[in-house]
Interface confidence: medium
Amino acid sequence: MDGSGEQPRGGGPTSSEQIMKTGALLLQGFIQDRAGRMGGEAPELALDPVPQDASTKKLSECLKRIGDELDSNMELQRMIAAVDTDSPREVFFRVAADMFSDGNFNWGRVVALFYFASKLVLKALCTKVPELIRTIMGWTLDFLRERLLGWIQDQGGWDGLLSYFGTPTWQTVTIFVAGVLTASLTIWKKMG
């Protein structure tokens, strides 16, 4: 990732501000959607609803679809279930760092990061640690800003996600996403 130097200004799709705003909206919506599928109300996730434009709605639908597919990957679910959340910050940043450790960036890995964050949030809900929820969202946005922002800008903003997953082979790509996350969790388990 080309990391240094000033970022584009203004409100275009590749500005730092717009990428972070859209990223926060997508992450919040994705986590709320995953929690909703668990059944039951989660007042801790009653974050301020933010109006989404047509483009963001499309992106949200795309993420939901990938999330559903990942939910059905039993190997991935088994790995996530085995994650020890006693030190969630260390787990999150190690797994996130390992996902991108080879220096190669793609939308699949960005989605894998969001999915892992959502799973940690759901674990926090299940273990009655609601204060962790906003914190995990914060960690994800920190990582996004520090590691992925430049790359997302290079892709023309978040809309690049739609073209990446908008192909007939998006299920194949989703299998790849699951593989990336499973591999990172495996590395973390070995190191932990």
Epitope: A97, D142, E146
Partner: antibody, heavy 117, light 109 residues
Framework: EVQLVESGGGLVQPGGSLRLSCAAS????????IHWVRQAPGKGLEWVAS????????YYADSVKGRFTISADTSKNTAYLQMNSLRAEDTAVYYC??????????WGQGTLVTVSS | DIQMTQSPSSLSASVGDRVTITCRAS??????VAWYQQKPGKAPKLLIY???SLYSGVPSRFSGSRSGTDFTLTISSLQPEDFATYYC???????????FGQGTKVEIK
Amino acid sequence: EVQLVESGGGLVQPGGSLRLSCAASGFNLYYSSIHWVRQAPGKGLEWVASIYPYSGSTYYADSVKGRFTISADTSKNTAYLQMNSLRAEDTAVYYCARSYGYAMDYWGQGTLVTVSS
Amino acid sequence: DIQMTQSPSSLSASVGDRVTITCRASQSVSSAVAWYQQKPGKAPKLLIYSASSLYSGVPSRFSGSRSGTDFTLTISSLQPEDFATYYCQQSYYWVSPFTFGQGTKVEIK
């Protein structure tokens, strides 16, 4: 042009408090991450604390945890380091820096904090 | 915490010499390593980020490389203005956000 300007340093007695400011210009602090790094006389660089205003996340070195507090006022585009229970070993030049990706790309000129009786 | 062991702590060299400074991470830090130059009484300046990327405005005689957990800063032909102290720094993940090496002072022979 990106600029970071620190202020608030000075002489303080052990156990005393001091608040350092880091005024940023040329970029939006809200979407950035700001870090305080210190350098004791004749010594190397030591990371002290970080803040990510967008998410509200803050991180501290073990040596200052519980004594120092990093914060940001995005309306003033300024970050702060509140230093309490100061010790002689906190004597150093304190720099604020902005990071992007894997590096701190812009640094302030530094402000000297001397803890002595 | 991740430790960054920098060597040598100081070295003497002449103008035109090729200078190499190394940093070893105590565990994998991917390519999340930067190098800085600091002159007396001044703030550090970024030279290299992401292990091998040259920061804008930095002369091309500076280069960085990575081999596993070993990171190297090379100055291909030392210039008078290069006499300074150099630091490596890692930022792999934020359990301890940034760790600096001990520094290498490059002096005139």
